[in-house]
Every structure is written in C-alpha cells, then in structure tokens.
C-alpha cells in the first residue's frame, strides 16, 4: 500500500510461493533455500523466482517445487510469534542477474535504518487491488518501544516494526513471507498488522536476526552430503 | 450455529429513508467484514457497499454514495443499512453478507467471498 | 471497474447431465473469483471461492476452473436441486465488488 511499481528484477531474492495463485512471498537465501513466513505454510507450493509480472510468462521465472517445508517448531499460530519457514527447492535455483540469494543478517535491526519491502500483496488499505507487478516500499524500522505501544501486549522480541505510524505506506494481505531488506541484509519477513496502511498500526516483521542460528542448522540438517570411504 | 438475522420487509414513500438490521450470531461480529447486496425483482445482485466492523471503516458503490449509510453498533453484534431519498427503482430485497475468513492479522493471501447471507429484506418504494 | 459477463444467460440441460458455464472477466482477477447458487425466493449460497475451493458442505459435482480472466463453473451430472440461478463474483480489485449477470439453469 503506498508504494511503487519495483523496477524490473530489481529484488532478485524475491520469490512467489503459489499454489495454484500466488499466496505469499519469499526470500532466496541460497541456490537450494527460500525463507518465508511461518504462516504460509502449505503441504505443496511451488516457488517461482525472477518473477516481476506474476500473470505474465516474461522469460526470466524459474519455477521449482519445493521438496521440504519445515515450519519452526515453536510457531504459535495464536500470536504469530516465531513466524518463520524454511522451503528446500527440489532443485538449485540457477543463479544470475534477476535470481540471487539475500545475506542473512549480521547485526538486530536498528531503529531509523531506511529499509526495502516488496510484494504482489493487496495495494489497498480498504478495499482490495491485487497487482500483477511487483510492488516496493521504502520504510524506516521503527523503535522497539513504538511497535509496542502499537500493539500493546502483543510484540514479541522475534518481532519488530517498519513502517509510518501515520499511516498510508505498508505491506498487506498477499506479501507475508517477503522480505524487509536493510544494507544488503534480510532483517525482516512481513508478518501481520491490525490491517493495511492504518494510523498507528505499522506492519510487523519477523527478527531474522533472532534465526541465524535456526536457519543455519536447519539447512546442514538438510542437506545430504554423501561421504565416500 | 453462525447466522445472519436482518429486519422485516418495509414499504417506503418516495423521498423517504429505510434503515435494515442485520443481526450476527455464531462468530465474532468484529472479526469479519460485511457487506450490503440488493436485488431488484427479477435481476442480478447489486454490490452496495461494505462495513469493517471493528473500525466503522466503510466503502459504498460510487453508485450509492451520498445516499447510503452503513453503520454498526459492536454491542449488539448489528449492522445497518440507511438508504435515503428512496425512488421507485430502489425496489429490491436488500441482503447483509459476511466476508469468509476472518481479517486475520497475518499477511498471507486468503481468497473471499461472501460465505454468509441474511434472509434478506424486502424493500418497496411506492407512492 | 471490472466487468463480469456470465454466458449463457440461460441454460437447459437433462437430469444427469453435464454443465458447464461460463463467466469472464475484463481484465485479469487472478484466482479471485466465487461463484453462487440462488434459488428463487432464497438468499444466494457460496458454491466455490478462489476459482476452484468447494466451500463447505459444497458436493463434489460442483468444481471450479480458471484463472485471469476465464473462468468455468461444471456440475458433472446435474440433480434436481441444481436448477437455479448461478452468479460469478470478482474479489480481486474493489469497490466496486462486480458480480456476473447470471445463468440460469434450467430443465431440458
């Protein structure tokens, strides 16, 4: 809501999860590994990378059926906390100008930091228009202490804020699982808000940074490395 | 069970104004948009407008702006329907339809589509 | 504003038999469509959403197809209960919400 039509392959970690439609977005972590959100979770999806104009076959797409989804284990439906998924492609994705992965990040997000979102969500904050194009918003993160006083009550510290606290710019139904990038770095995945674009309402993200470890773990639990003797 | 119960059938002057009720029960009222749906006798649906119960929020059909207000009261888990400067071709019945799936906080992609309706209300202009 | 136009507007068909109708759109919608049932003297009822998800209580020879701008309802082998009124829905950019003209369905 409030943002811009992303120039062409610009977001290249961006990824459509579909099933049948596009239902949530990703972000390309490695050739093999996609990071959404916890609550796209679906038993068949099919990822499709270097998207731009998700109704139209533009020559750059790549579409690869996931071949494991694994949900973090403490996911709490109820509250959103810990809103994160990992996908394993069932074939690397080919790596180039319009497909590439995203750096996991190095440091928390910092309150002030300017930041990129991106999606094919809803671009209405009443009423609904679904683009075919990709969309991008910049948005600053916001203090911890106004995402909570937001949502009071309901801020975890595996969430944090981006947006305007006056409303008009923010992710809506259709981009959870997309990615919140800051200085090259995946901070954030889009996650929930008391709906789109609302005064006093900003999106709210899930910490990635909280999820190195997880992410990294999950991935060599994963990966099969065949030894010879 | 969840149900959608509106007011009784109204006859109007022209010029006049109708208020329909529509009563929700079985769900959290605040957790579902509503929508208004007419019929002329004889027609297709007609798209009214739409309430978000837990803001107020609205959006009427360019066609009915100005002369349509929709409204809620939570406490009672109602919302209303005002059509004012009522004029003979406003004959229909008038149904409340409730959004599926509730306006979820999370931010993935669910489909809609009205998977609720009230009985629907009678409404007849005549002079 | 996005145009629905439902074809045929009527449709007679036997007991038993196949039925397939037809609604586009103007422009693409996506997978944002649903289609309704209406019988006279009754409020519409949800058959599908998302172009192809029965809903609830929906039997399974009602199924949904399409996407973008195409769209088809088929009952498989239409029962008595089946003849009524049939509208498509868009849910993809609103206000307005736009609804099809409607087919009738009706005994052969």
């Known amino acids: 809501v409030g943002g811009y039509i992303c120039e062409e392959n610009s977001v290249p970690y961006q990824v459509s999860l579909n099933s049948g439609y596009h239902f949530c977005g990703g972000s390309l972590i490695s050739e093999q590994w996609v990071v959404s959100a916890g609550h796209c979770y679906k038993s068949r999806i099919q990822v499709r990378l270097g998207e731009h104009n998700i109704e139209v076959l533009e020559g750059n797409e790549q579409f690869i059926n996931a071949a494991k989804i694994i949900r973090h284990p403490k996911y709490n439906s109820r509250t959103l906390d810990n809103d994160i998924l990992l996908i394993k492609l069932s074939s690397p994705a080919v790596i180039n100008s319009r497909v590439s992965a995203i750096s996991l990040p190095t440091a928390p997000p910092a309150a002030g930091t300017e930041s990129l979102i991106s999606g094919w969500g809803n671009t209405l904050s009443s009423g609904a228009d679904y683009p075919d194009e990709l969309q991008c918003l910049d948005a600053p993160v916001l203090s911890q202490a106004e995402c909570e006083a937001s949502y009071p009550g309901k801020i975890t510290n595996n969430m944090f804020c981006v947006g305007f606290l006056e409303g008009g710019k923010d992710s809506c139904q259709g981009d959870a699982g997309g990615p919140v990038v800051s200085n090259g770095e995946l901070q954030g995945i889009v996650s929930w808000g008391y709906g789109c674009a609302q005064k006093n309402r900003p999106g709210v993200y899930t910490k990635v940074y909280n999820y190195v470890d997880w992410i990294k773990d999950t991935i060599a639990a994963n990966s099969h490395h065949h030894h010879h003797h | 069970q969840v149900q959608l119960v509106q007011s009784g059938a109204e006859v109007k002057k022209p010029g006049a104004s109708v208020k329909v009720s529509c009563k929700a029960s079985?769900?959290?009222?605040?957790?579902?948009?509503m929508h208004w749906v007419r019929q002329a006798p004889g027609q297709g649906l007609e798209w009214m407008g739409s309430?978000?119960?837990?803001?107020?929020?609205?959006n009427y059909a360019q066609k009915f702006q100005g002369r349509v207000t929709m409204t809620r009261d939570t406490s009672i888990s109602t919302a209303y329907m005002e059509l004012s400067r009522l004029r003979s071709d406003d004959t229909a019945v008038y149904y409340c339809?409730?959004?599926?799936?509730?306006?979820?906080?999370?931010?993935?992609?669910?489909?809609?589509?009205?998977?609720?309706w009230g009985q629907g209300t009678m409404v007849t202009v005549s002079s | 504003e996005i145009v629905m136009t439902q074809s045929p507007a009527t449709l007679s068909v036997s007991p038993g038999e196949r039925a397939t109708l037809s609604c586009r759109a103007s422009?693409?919608?996506?997978?944002?469509l649903a289609w309704y049932q209406q019988k006279p003297g009754q409020a519409p009822r949800l058959l599908i959403y998302?172009?192809?998800t029965r809903a609830t209580g929906i039997p399974a020879r009602f199924s949904g197809s399409g996407s973008g701008t195409e769209f088809t309802l088929t009952i498989s082998s239409l029962q008595s209960e089946d003849f009524a009124v049939y509208y498509c829905?868009?849910?993809?950019?609103?206000?307005?919400?736009?609804f099809g003209g409607g087919t009738k369905v009706e005994i052969k």
């Open positions: 339809a409730r959004v599926g799936g509730a306006a979820a906080a999370g931010k993935a992609y669910t489909a809609s589509a009205f998977d609720i």
């Open positions: 079985g769900y959290t009222f605040t957790g579902y948009y």
């Open positions: 309430i978000n119960p837990s803001s107020g929020g609205t």
């Open positions: 422009q693409s919608v996506g997978s944002n």
């Open positions: 998302g172009a192809s």
């Open positions: 829905q868009q849910f993809h950019n609103w206000p307005p919400l736009t």
